[in-house]
Amino acid sequence: QPEQKTLSLPGTYRHVDRTTGQVLTCDKCPAGTYVSEHCTNMSLRVCSSCPAGTFTRHENGIERCHDCSQPCPWPMIERLPCAALTDRECICPPGMYQSNGTCAPHTVCPVGWGVRKKGTENEDVRCKQCARGTFSDVPSSVMKCKAHTDCLGQNLEVVKPGTKETDNVCGMRLFFSSTNPPSSGTVTFSHPEHMESHDVPSSTYEPQGMNSTDSNSTASVRTKVPSGIEEGTVPDNTSSTSGKEGTNRTLPNPPQVTHQQAPHHRHILKLLPSSMEATGEKSSTAIKAPKRGHPRQNAHKHFDINEH
């Protein structure tokens, strides 16, 4: 109903009784209700509860409650339900963020890159290239670069130096008499975490278009998360999208990684005399779910002169 747009005392609103033309000051109704009958010269205003599917957030002088926002479109989930006091609020599920009104999967930082800033339901993950002394051997949207294993600290020696993509391989050499060399050398090495076997390409993976010295870049590979993938697993990379933050950087798809978790045990590697290379790589599969940030308020906003 058309109202006189003048200021009124806190807790009151101005109402024009259109039948008489009189401007009246009425008490507002509490949040979760609306004015079902305005005050008159003779009577107080009457408040009624907001019917299902509607709400009012504040005390108000409005004649009908606001309609709640539409049910959350897939894949969004409800953060707040539609209730008398609150509008429905939709957010992106864990592992996704809000972009152009829908949910996009968090960027998966490729091998050799780690999470610089965790993603939230409103912000994408920021990736950075692993610095010297750190590595990331799995594509992940939640894992930071990990420090190379300190072999010396474990009274072991570095059998194979780590890279941005692999951990140090530690080993303990067993020396034999030079007069009786064994047919094959033996190196033992230990990792305090689960061992995983990986299909690793022979060439070192260097994301194109990224300066290898730039440790604060935002990687632009976004791995699409197939529906039905469980939280806490690292999905396969199936596609990529172009750069973010105004830098037209692009990355090729990171290499495919097959995760096969092995039991926790020491590995004994038989090394042929011609080669002292160990191929075991260390990785952690304890992936934490992304933290939730502060979601953007629902776009469905209401303003009414008599509600504030």
Partner: antibody
Framework: QVQLQQSGPEVARPGASVKLSCKAS????????LNWVKQRTGQGLEWIGE????????YYNEKFKGKATLTADNSSSTAYLQFSSLTSEDSAVYFC??????WGQGTLVTVSV | DILMTQSPSSMSVSLGDTVSITCHAS??????IGWLQQKPGKSFKGLIY???TLEDGVPSRFTGSGSGADFSLTISSLESEDFADYYC?????????FGGGTKLEIK
Amino acid sequence: QVQLQQSGPEVARPGASVKLSCKASGYTFTDYYLNWVKQRTGQGLEWIGEIYPGNNHTYYNEKFKGKATLTADNSSSTAYLQFSSLTSEDSAVYFCTRGVIKWGQGTLVTVSV
Amino acid sequence: DILMTQSPSSMSVSLGDTVSITCHASQGIRNSIGWLQQKPGKSFKGLIYHATTLEDGVPSRFTGSGSGADFSLTISSLESEDFADYYCVQYAQFPYTFGGGTKLEIK
């Protein structure tokens, strides 16, 4: 009791302006909105706009913006409707009303060459 | 603008009859409707406001009903002074709009 006394009939030439008055009595003039309504024979009723003398807040029907001007003089408890650039379409009876219940007796405006 | 469709546009009735005039709003207007009476050559008199509330001094044979978009004015036991034009008016939304009117004539 509440009374709205309107000015007498007007005859005007096309292109001219007229200013109609509505003197209120029997209530506090600045506490109530006053509306103006146009009635043309065979054309039904049209709401022109309203004024709140308490702060001179006005609201017009889009159709009458630029054609009608509403004012009020609180010292004499009188509301005014000025119609400009008159045409034959403006020939009608004009009523002032307080809300939808109290009505003035109407003023006939005739626009003729 | 809200269109108020009033019917019938005219009706011939006899003294003592009961008549109903209806008004349909093009959208819901809750109960923000009034009914007016106009006698030939005269001004308007407010009969009913808020769809159902009778104005002071108006005989109880006038009753208003309806809510939302469909409303009616019923006059029971018609008397000679009731023969006039009747209009509905909505004041839920600017601009206020009126029905086309119903002319009540003696049969």
